[in-house]
């Protein structure tokens, strides 16, 4: 009973988690800049892994996507593609841990079966946290860093002149809500791992039996295993099974280099 | 790179019209506003007035309501329709777009190189 709340309480904090670390790559609040007033009206810029947005104090909301792929930063790819992998694994996890869970029937799956698709779930919801976790992490270091924002600097380019503006940029709503499904589905991942050796059949030592015709006893030889009926002279065989079954336990053994039960 | 080309300056009698145009090229995101300054012989570069994306303008202070900006926001092109011009109207006029580039370069202004507007009578 245990072992099917730890799944089950697995497979939906994994769930959550994975949804949020989806909804977080989509949002557009992973960095902010505070509003400014600038010579026009209050403006709120923010920027997302896909586009960037311009919010007016009027209500006015503008974004636009990133221009080109090749002209990005190698660290925003970086966080792109943890984000996908984030993604991707965690909905692979989820599909086969459906199948996984013990409260669901799927023909004759053993217990072994499911302990393992419950195994490599887990696994798989772990890496996914981590993945979210380290692609928000690496963003936020971008964001402390502020490589671009040194200083305000002015400098001639195609057209005219450039004027960089001193701006400093926050962590957006994305990066907690990321770093949160992150760890949810890590914790998730880590239930799932748990369940798993509860759901595991424990080896059992089953006792070898072995059954005799009733009315009378069977002898082995060591020569080619020929049995004789017991009713002659029994001067060769080494050993003699009355009928009826015994376990191996409760014969006793004698050291033999003959002796093969 | 984006680029500013500015258009529409020249040679203009007091209480004649003319309309400067600029348009920005090349990689853009998120625009805070467009505008245009102005920059008489030797005196300070000033404001003429200033558009956001929403539609918000702002004016210089000596302008009385002569000048209207307006803006295309699906061209990435701002205009300024000057009307009424005075002999104190001539300038360098300054297109300057206001970028937002987030984590990719911050927050960069872009200025045009320049169009003469001269009233001459």
């Known amino acids: 009973m245990a072992v099917t709340a730890c799944q089950g309480l697995g497979f939906v904090v994994s769930l959550i988690g994975i949804a949020g670390i989806i909804a977080a790559t989509c949002m557009d609040q992973w960095s902010t800049q505070d509003l400014y007033n600038n010579p026009v009206t209050a403006v709120f810029n923010y920027q997302g892994l896909w586009r960037s947005c311009v919010r007016e104090s009027s209500g006015f909301t503008e974004c636009r996507g990133y221009f080109t792929l090749l002209g990005l930063p190698a660290m925003l790819q970086a966080v792109r593609a943890l984000m996908i992998v984030g993604i991707v694994l965690g909905a692979i996890g989820l599909l086969v841990s459906i199948f996984a869970l013990k409260c669901i029937r799927i023909g004759s799956m053993e217990d072994s079966a499911k302990a393992n698709m419950t195994l490599t779930s887990g696994i798989m919801f772990i890496v996914s946290g981590l993945c979210a976790i380290a692609g928000v992490s690496v963003f936020a270091n971008m964001l402390v860093t502020n490589f671009w924002m040194s200083t305000a600097n002015m400098y001639t380019g195609m057209g005219g002149m450039v004027q960089t503006v001193q701006t400093r940029y926050t962590f957006g709503a994305a990066l907690f809500v990321g770093w949160v499904a992150g760890g949810l589905t890590l914790i998730g991942g880590v239930m799932m791992c748990i369940a798993c050796r509860g759901l595991a059949p424990e080896e059992t030592n089953y006792k070898a039996v072995s059954y005799h015709a009733s009315g009378h006893s069977v002898a082995y030889k060591p020569g080619g295993f020929k049995a004789s009926t017991g009713f002659g002279s029994n001067t060769k065989n080494k050993k003699i099974y009355d009928g009826g079954a015994r376990t191996e336990d409760e014969v006793q053994s004698y050291p033999s280099k003959h002796d093969y039960v | 790179e984006v680029q500013l080309v500015e258009s529409g300056g020249g040679l203009v009698q007091p209480g004649g019209s003319l309309r400067l145009s600029c348009a920005a090229s090349?990689?853009?995101?998120?625009?805070?506003?467009a505008g245009w300054y102005r920059q008489a012989p030797g005196k300070e570069r000033e404001l003429v007035a200033l558009i956001t994306r929403g539609g918000s303008t702002t004016y210089g202070a000596s302008l009385k309501g002569r000048f209207t900006i307006s803006s295309d926001n699906a061209k990435d092109t701002v205009y300024l329709q000057m009307s009424s011009l005075q002999p104190d109207d001539t300038a360098v006029y300054y297109c300057n777009f206001r970028i937002n580039f987030g984590i990719l370069g911050g927050l960069r202004d872009y200025w045009g190189q320049g169009t003469q507007v001269t009233v001459s009578p």
């Open positions: 090349g990689n853009i995101l998120s625009i805070n506003y």
